[in-house]
Structure formats: structure tokens, C-alpha cells
Amino acid sequence: DSSKWVFEHPETLYAWEGACVWIPCTYRALDGDLESFILFHNPEYNKNTSKFDGTRLYESTKDGKVPSEQKRVQFLGDKNKNCTLSIHPVHLNDSGQLGLRMESKTEKWMERIHLNVSERPFPPHIQLPPEIQESQEVTLTCLLNFSCYGYPIQLQWLLEGVPMRQAAVTSTSLTIKSVFTRSELKFSPQWSHHGKIVTCQLQDADGKFLSNDTVQLNVKHTPKLEIKVTPSDAIVREGDSVTMTCEVSSSNPEYTTVSWLKDGTSLKKQNTFTLNLREVTKDQSGKYCCQVSNDVGPGRSEEVFLQVQYAPEPSTVQILHSPAVEGSQVEFLCMSLANPLPTNYTWYHNGKEMQGRTEEKVHIPKILPWHAGTYSCVAENILGTGQRGPGAELDVQYPPKKVTTVIQNPMPIREGDTVTLSCNYNSSNPSVTRYEWKPHGAWEEPSLGVLKIQNVGWDNTTIACAACNSWCSWASPVALNVQYAPRDVRVRKIKPLSEIHSGNSVSLQCDFSSSHPKEVQFFWEKNGRLLGKESQLNFDSISPEDAGSYSCWVNNSIGQTASKAWTLEVLYAPRRLRVSMSPGDQVMEGKSATLTCESDANPPVSHYTWFDWNNQSLPYHSQKLRLEPVKVQHSGAYWCQGTNSVGKGRSPLSTLTVYYSPETIGRR
């Protein structure tokens, strides 16, 4: 109630001889500050004197002086809230009640604190969880109801007398609520810790033993088992017997059931500590263990690997990369169940032994078409040789091989023929699905791999084909060697280089651009008449009569070809001039007489000149000389001269006779 002083401190403090006591303490006085403080040991109230009797351990006066013998006890408080005390060292006879006599100006109070000082350091107390299971982390607690600033201590954990490796966490409390030192150790006990002694040892600052507490661990765990096998290496041959024994080395609590497992699966009707396997087969190879259960759970022994040895079983071949592309690499793997593992292998390709191949894997660095086929193997171990299995098929894919373009026609091929070609190949994998031809043309392919060229051209020289599967293989081009009649036959003048004049030496050449076969014959023709059989037609001295239309023919075994007609033109001076008279060479005076200068000339006469019987040129220059009216005086001999670019020609004299008319005669 409100008439009480309020104190807070631990109810009892514990220590031992020679240690110290630190008493955390707070208070609140009823009024004002503390004026007087006395620490009694076992105080008793004297009703007569109305004062407390007892040993005074500490006394503070108004002037704050403390007698020198009171140095062992220290008041660490103040005048209004802190009443903390320290006794150092503390003695056995300090046990009992401590009385804190507090006085203020108007109020007094006696506060009692119990002090328990033992002769020797008292042991700490180990606290364990209610149940400990293997591999489950637990916290072990070691608690000592002591802590004092002036007397450092340490708590150490030991397992079977050996310091524990795990790190402990030590904490201290020096509060008005509690005074203690505590060490906590996190620990995952194993089954092997069952029954072991754990110690918490109290030591002074130098590690000197002061006291301890011990507990025996009760670690709940599944049964711990040992498996024994006969024969000890667990390696047997088919038909042998095997015995396995299961021994329980530890179980907490006691075990309840036993079973056996092979490769993790429980074996039926095997519920004893001994497993007998009679006349084992290879199927009984595997990992065996026994399983024993208790309330914690099942425990399993280590596995025993029972190896039932046997000769290799029929082998199979695994091919890495089939189908394989020619030139690539391929690996073969021989798979055969055997125990022990095969030490030697024999490989076969299409039934024939592959020399020098004795390993589980065969690697072919560059696959070729002839590597295709069936690969099989035989495995061998110490117990014998296996059988050859069915093998595996290697498919080697490659472009078509030895592709050729073949001309189906009888030879020779003539221009205009229909030519049939086929594209042949030796082998192909996968099969050929299409063909290509070079050069491209508007040709028909009547069937796969056949090309038909209708009306073959003279200039169809070479053709190549390709046979294609996933790849195309081209054949070497084949020459069609088309035969044809001579082509582009024409007449060409070799000499003279300029125009031909009468009397010149003239050579004409019969040209052609090509002929197959090359052997040819020539023919020259003029107006349907054969002139010669050489490639040239020669005129030593050309005459105007040689002019005309010439053709040459060239023929070979295929046919003949004519040139276009070529006109030979001979230039010559006017010749064969004559003067013709119309209406005749006798004309009556007064009539009209026409003289014509006729000539043969190439080019035609460009200029005429007329002469009379006196060789006097007349003032007329056209082909015709017209006398109208004609006079008797015109009678006489006339001649003409014709001129062209080549030269001049003159006619012989022609006489004109002009006779008198009847009228003139009548007048005479």
C-alpha cells in the first residue's frame, strides 16, 4: 500500500566462499531522499529499544564516511532509486539474511534479502528437452544461479570427458529480476551418443575446475544394423549359395520387426535375421539390405552389392548416327550384359571379322559406301564368350556415283535427227529422284533420266547430266558430235580487189563457215553449166562474155549446200560500135533520117561523139543523130565514138545516101 517503500531485487542470492555477491537493487522512498543506510547481517528488531540489532556490515552516515573495515561491502546505490550492493569476497558466514535499513527525513524501512553462501562452488544444472531423437537438433542448457562482476566464471561442455566441438552461447543476467550464468549448446545427437555422459563444468577465469553437473543422454534412434555376407566379397557365380545375416548393434527403443530389401523393394516372406539365397541366378544380382523397425522408425543396414557373375549375354550393337553421310564419322557400341564386364570384344562387318577391333566401341573416322551393312559383336569375360546378336544395320548415304551421259542414237548424229540421251549411274543412296541437264533447252524428258532432243541443231555441242538424290552428281559433258551439211556457203571475190575490167586476172573463192564432217567437195556453176571442182574459180583474162550469174556448191557426206547466185560483172570500153540508119541508108531529101550509135559497153556509154566523112566532129553528143529535113548535101560516110569510164570505142563508117525528091527532079 501507499505506506510502503517499494523495492525490487532478487529474493535470494547464491554464492560460495571466496566468491562475491552482486546484489542488483532498486527502491523508491516514501518521501525525500535517503539520508541514512545500514546493511545488517541477520537483523532482529529490539522492541525495547525500537531498533534493529545485528552485525552491521555497512553503514553510511550523513557525511558519507565509511569505516575502513567496511571496504569488503560496497553500497553502489544512490539517495533515491539505486540500492545495488556488492560483497567481495563473500564468506560462508555471510549466509543468512541481509537487512537494508533505509531512513529518510521522516520515514524508515527495513528490506530483507536472502544470501546463500556455500562452502564450495555449487554445481550448475543441466536442462535437457523431454525427448532427444537422433539427428534432430536440440539445445542443451546449463544454468548456474550465480553471477558477479568481480568474479568471472566459465561454463564448459564435455561429452564423455572430452570438450564438445560445438560452439556454446554463454549469457549472464545481473538484474533485479534474476542473477544467473547460462550456457546453451545447440547439438545434433547421433545414435552413437545414446547413453553417453554430458558434463557442464564450472570453471574460474583461469579454467580451474570449480564444480559440474552430468546427465546421461537418452537418444531415441532407429535400429542400427550390420550386415554380414558369406562369401564376404558377395561375388558368386550362378548356382552358388549366399547367406546374409543382419545384426542389430543398437536400438532405442527396442526393435519390433525385421525385413529384407533388394534394390529398394521388400522381399516377401523374409522376416528373420538371416537371408539364405540358394542356387542364385543373375537376376538376383543387386543391392541387398536388411530393415529393422522400432517406434522411432525403420533402420536400414548398409547395402551389400551381390554380384552374380555370368558369361556375356547375346550382344546388341548401337550405332551413333545412322543413316550416316559418306565422309562423316560413325561410332558403334557393343552392348552385352555380363558380370564381370567384358574385357574383350570381337567385331564383325557383314559376318566378316574386323581385324584389330577389340574394344567396346568402334569408331570409323570417315565412312565410305562400302562400310554400309550389318555390324555385330561378341563380348568376352573370364566366364566365357557371349553369342553374336542380330547386329545393327548401318545405312551410308552418298551422292550418285559414276554418273555418265550416254547417247542412245546410232552414230553419227545428223542435224535434224531426234537424239535420245540417258543419264546413267553406278550406285546411289538414297535412290535417285531427279535428273538435271546442262545446257537447258526446250527438250522433253519422256521418262526419268532420259532426254529427247527433237530436230537436233548443228550447234548442239555437249550435254551433261546430273543424277540427284539428296545431292547432285554431274557427269562429264558428252560431245554430241552432230554432223551437218556445209553451212553459210558464199561466193567471195579474191582478186582483183577493185572492180573487174576486161582482161583482168580474176579469182573467186567458194567459202563456208563450217562443215561436219570436214571433208568437202566444191562445184562451180554458171547458168546450169559445171565450171570447176576446186574451192577457187580462176580467170586468167576475163572477158565480157564471162560475166553472168555464178553459184558454188559445197558438199560433204551429209549433204550439199549452194551459195546464193553471185553476179560477175566485167567492165569494158565501148566495143562493137556501129551506126545504124533509120528508115534506111537511102533517104529522100526532105524526109527525116536518124543515125543511131549502137555499142556494147559496161558501164554503158556516157558520151557520144559524131564524125563525118572528113573526120570532122559534129556538134551532136547523144546516141541518136537526127537529120530533119535531110538534104542531099548530108550524103556521105558517118562514124561515131562512144566513151565510158573504161575507155573509148569507134564505129566503122556507114554511108548515108540522100536522093532528090521527084519535086526537085521535076524542077530540073
Partner: antibody, heavy 124, light 110 residues
Framework: QVTLKESGPGILQPSQTLSLTCSFS??????????VGWIRQPSGKGLEWLAH???????YYNPALKSRLTISKDTSKNQVFLKIANVDTADTATYYC????????????????WGTGTTVTVSA | QAVVTQESALTTSPGETVTLTCRSS?????????ANWVQEKPDHLFTGLIG???NRAPGVPARFSGSLIGDKAALTITGAQTEDEAIYFC?????????FGSGTKVTVLG
């Protein structure tokens, strides 16, 4: 009968490109399983494989020289070529070409037939 | 790059058996190294003897055989003849390139 014949410039200067030709007869590089390789031998020393080429145009090069080497073939002319760029005196050697073949019925390759070599001197 | 090591020289007598070995610096020689053995006779006359570790090239006498002995490739001449006096080179395949050994000079004392 299989024969191989190497030809080269005989002598060339540092930094030039060495061009070698291997002309062969008795087999074709269009035939499956056929290859031609180049090997050199500096005077008094061992053999150094340079490169080889297979019928299917697969090419392999000595890693230490790869950046300088080019191997090629002309199947129709039965020739294989090797170019070595930026030569120096260390490239002085006898250069051999050899057929590398996988004969019919075999699974591995052989350096079975060799040329007689051509001597190349790199000199400043 | 790997180094391929061979005995520098071996001496034998006619009719004797001699074994040449070929070691790889990268570890054990396996069948995947496709060991090849090549014979060099005077005047740069080279002939391929063995391919793929243990396969004789066509036309090679049966006295030449290839094998793996321990971690090395080996060439055995069973019943050596005087004409077998030569330098023998091995070549090992490393995934994408060959490396030749330094060669073993075999002397057949007649």
C-alpha cells in the same frame, strides 16, 4: 601404279607465298576414300604434317600453321595444291605429298604412297 | 600442341623381334589416335605400313604389326630383315590434325 610428284619454285624470298603442286596418277580424287596430304621435312629433322584434303572436299590443317595454309584440288587434272603465305627461313624444307587412302575393305586411313619430295629454300 | 615421342634409335639383328613405341604428351594413346607408321628408306623413299593403330596397309609384309602397349602405340617387327633398316615415323591423329613423332632409326646388324 600409283605415283605422286611434287613441284615448287625451288627458291623464294621471305614474305612471299609458296605455291606447291602435287601431280598424281594411278588413282582419282573423285573416288571415295581417297585423300592427298602435304608433309615437310627440314634438313636433318623429323616430319611435320601440314594439311590434307579428301575426295569429299574435307580439309584439315596443322593448327600451328592454319592461318598461312590453303589446300585445294583439281580433280579433273589429278592435282592438289598447297599455298603457304608469308614464308620465312623456317619454311625451308623438303615438301612431300602423300596419298592418304582408306582402301576398299578397310576402316582406317593410311599414308600409303609418297612422292619423292621437292626442296624449297627460303632465302633473303 | 601435343608432342609425340619415339625412341631415337634401336638396334636389332636379323630374325630378332624389335618393338618401337610412340608416346603422346597429352596422355594415353588410344585407338581414337589412329596411329600410323611410316617407313623412310634412303633417298627419301617413304612407305605407309600401319594405319588405325593395328591395320597393315595393303602389300605390307606380315612381319610388321601395330598395337597399343600400355599407354603407347607400338610397331613390332617380328623377324627383322636387313632391308628393314630404316627410319620409322609414327603419326597420331588429334581430332582434326596429325602430329608426327621424331622418328626411330632402326639398325639391323647383319
Amino acid at each position: 601404279q600409283v605415283t605422286l610428284k611434287e613441284s615448287g619454285p625451288g627458291i623464294l624470298q621471305p614474305s612471299q607465298t609458296l605455291s606447291l603442286t602435287c601431280s598424281f596418277s594411278g588413282f582419282s580424287l573423285s573416288t571415295s576414300g581417297m585423300g592427298v596430304g602435304w608433309i615437310r621435312q627440314p634438313s636433318g629433322k623429323g616430319l611435320e604434317w601440314l594439311a590434307h584434303i579428301w575426295w569429299d572436299d574435307d580439309e584439315y590443317y596443322n593448327p600451328a600453321l592454319k592461318s598461312r595454309l590453303t589446300i585445294s584440288k583439281d580433280t579433273s587434272k589429278n592435282q592438289v595444291f598447297l599455298k603457304i603465305a608469308n614464308v620465312d627461313t623456317a619454311d625451308t624444307a623438303t615438301y612431300y605429298c602423300a596419298r592418304i587412302s582408306i582402301p576398299y575393305g578397310y576402316y582406317d586411313w593410311f599414308f600409303d604412297v609418297w612422292g619423292t619430295g621437292t626442296t624449297v629454300t627460303v632465302s633473303a | 600442341q601435343a608432342v609425340v615421342t619415339q625412341e631415337s634409335a634401336l638396334t636389332t639383328s636379323p630374325g630378332e623381334t624389335v618393338t618401337l613405341t610412340c608416346r603422346s604428351s597429352t596422355g594415353a594413346v588410344t585407338t581414337r589416335n589412329y596411329a600410323n607408321w611410316v617407313q623412310e628408306k634412303p633417298d627419301h623413299l617413304f612407305t605407309g605400313l600401319i594405319g588405325g593403330t593395328n591395320n597393315r596397309a595393303p602389300g605390307v609384309p606380315a612381319r610388321f604389326s601395330g598395337s597399343l602397349i600400355g599407354d603407347k602405340a607400338a610397331l613390332t617387327i617380328t623377324g627383322a630383315q636387313t632391308e628393314d633398316e630404316a627410319i620409322y615415323f609414327c603419326a597420331l591423329w588429334y581430332s582434326n590434325h596429325f602430329i608426327f613423332g621424331s622418328g626411330t632409326k632402326v639398325t639391323v646388324l647383319g
